[in-house]
């Protein structure tokens, strides 16, 4: 993560403080909120990004139907606990000693409890369904062109290996992107689907985490693809454990 000595920044994460105090005067960047050193040649973990965000000043369908175990992040923002590698700790608690278990993307997967709540392991989110609605266009996008553009986006911008983009579904105006990545499939150095999905979510909301060019320029055969709504479903390797009270 090098840069000009007088202007040292992190291209992949705006929410950092950088200084040329690394080995040989190289640029070293630390995430806001946690102070953890980040690798600016790849995506920063969602946990560190959420922590940084909380520390920053406030300002016959082809479509997939998520199954009953799919989680949506309804709890919104919170200040998470991250492990030394930047992953979410399995158990998260707030300042009032209310605790809950989360999955690898930091979404709550149990009822809330007290400090006695046990979360034995961090359960991996292995399937993410990104549900988008695009703004009206003159006609529907060509499905194969749309598929190619979105796969290219995830490969180029987020450096997600193409094998983890399982499918792109389209039924105007709804687009669904399926990301799949089992624990056994994820090799060292592979971008996590949860981190890629989070960066994408921030990009389509116009809140890019990247320095430089910033916002997305999504185009299908020259036609702008503008997203007006995003909903993300998370499926875990082990189904979540909620009481019936929550489900009714």
């Amino acid at each position: 993560h090098t840069a000009a000595q007088d202007n040292c920044t992190c291209p992949t994460n705006k929410m950092t403080v950088c200084s040329p105090d690394g080995p040989g005067g190289r640029c070293q960047c630390r995430a806001l909120g946690s102070g953890v050193a980040v690798d600016c040649s790849t995506l920063t973990s969602k946990c560190l990004l959420l922590k940084a965000r909380m520390s920053a000043p406030k300002n016959a369908r082809t479509l997939v139907r998520p199954n009953e175990h799919a989680l949506v992040d309804n709890d919104g923002l919170y200040d998470p606990d991250c492990d030394p590698e930047g992953r979410f700790k399995a158990r998260q608690c707030n300042q009032t000693s209310v605790c809950w278990c989360v999955n690898s993307v930091g979404v709550r997967r149990t009822d809330k409890g007290d400090l006695s709540l046990r979360c034995d392991e961090l359960v991996r989110t292995h399937h993410i369904l990104i549900d988008l609605r695009h703004r009206p266009t003159a006609g529907a996008f060509n499905h194969s062109d749309l598929d190619a553009e979105l796969r290219r986006l995830f490969r180029e911008r987020y450096r997600l290996h193409p094998k983890f983009v399982a499918a792109v579904h389209y039924e105007q105006p709804t687009i669904q992107i399926e990301l799949r990545q089992n624990t056994s499939q994820k090799a060292a150095g592979d971008v996590d689907i949860g981190d890629a999905a989070y960066y994408f979510e921030r990009d389509v909301k116009g809140e890019s985490l990247f320095q430089g060019r910033g916002g997305l320029d999504l185009r299908v055969r020259g036609e702008p693809l503008q997203v007006e709504r995003t909903l993300i479903y998370y499926l875990d390797e082990i189904p979540p454990k909620f009481s019936m009270k929550r489900l009714t």
């Epitope: 993560h1 640029c27 180029e156 990247f210 320029d217 185009r219």
Partner: antibody
Framework: AVTLDESGGGLQTPGGGLSLVCKAS????????MFWVRQAPGKGLEWVAV????????NYAPAVKGRATISRDNGQSTLRLQLNNLRAEDTGTYYC???????????????????WGHGTEVIVSS | ALALTQPSSVSANPGETVKITCSGG???YGWFQQKSPGIAPVIVI????NRPSDIPSRFSGSKSGSTGTLTITGVQAEDEAVYFC???????????FGAGTTLTVL
């Protein structure tokens, strides 16, 4: 075959302006970022400017910022570089180049150049 | 502006393996071969490790951390040229090049 053909070079006077044109063929021009790169006589390569595929984003090297304008016409598959207030140090061969990674966070990188033109020579002299 | 760092010259006997390094960038690297000034450079590697189809397989690229490496396995006399690396300066969001490495085949 993918080709990039530059034109518009030649002898220029200091303080004047020039307009270089690059005609692209053999690929879907609208799908690629485009660059200008130059090389002064006996010197190394210098990144000059980049434009994204829609033309909504441009970026310039400090040496030409404020004097250069990069633009494109996707319908005609042409790239342009307008350079004003010419100086002797603008002398060199100007190359049009194609970028292979339009979505990348570091898409301005010279490391993505996957096709060069043959170049057009510019001499700034009185 | 920031320039990428590469050795000014390297030499090798025919058949030997040559490695040229490039550091100082914060993104992807490319490698360009120029046999004489004013003649358009030839792309030998782009995006760290992608080799164009018309480039011999003896040329390969890799990246470790913020250092890119061009490897020529079994160098040949016709590989004698100046090799420029190209990359990205994250502080200015601009492209940059190294000053060039002259490869001499003995």
């Amino acid at each position: 075959a993918v080709t990039l053909d530059e034109s518009g070079g030649g002898l220029q006077t200091p303080g004047g302006g020039l307009s270089l044109v690059c005609k692209a063929s053999g690929f879907d021009f609208i799908d690629y970022d485009m660059f200008w790169v130059r090389q002064a006589p006996g010197k190394g390569l210098e990144w000059v400017a980049v434009i994204n595929r829609s033309g909504s984003y441009t970026n310039y090297a400090p040496a030409v910022k404020g004097r250069a304008t990069i633009s494109r016409d996707n319908g005609q598959s042409t790239l342009r570089l307008q350079l004003n207030n010419l100086r002797a140090e603008d002398t060199g061969t100007y190359y049009c180049a194609r970028g292979a990674c339009t979505h990348c966070w570091d898409a301005d990188s010279a490391g993505y150049i996957d096709t060069w033109g043959h170049g057009t020579e510019v001499i700034v002299s009185s | 502006a920031l320039a990428l760092t590469q050795p000014s010259s390297v030499s090798a006997n025919p058949g030997e393996t040559v490695k040229i390094t490039c550091s100082g960038g914060s993104g992807s690297y490319g490698w360009f071969q120029q046999k004489s000034p004013g003649i358009a450079p030839v792309i030998v590697i782009f995006n760290d490790d992608n080799r164009p189809s018309d480039i011999p397989s003896r040329f390969s690229g890799s990246k470790s951390g913020s250092t890119g490496t061009l490897t020529i396995t079994g160098v040949q006399a016709e590989d004698e040229a100046v090799y420029f690396c190209g990359g990205y300066d994250g502080s200015t969001d601009a492209g940059i090049f190294g000053a060039g490495t002259t490869l001499t085949v003995l």
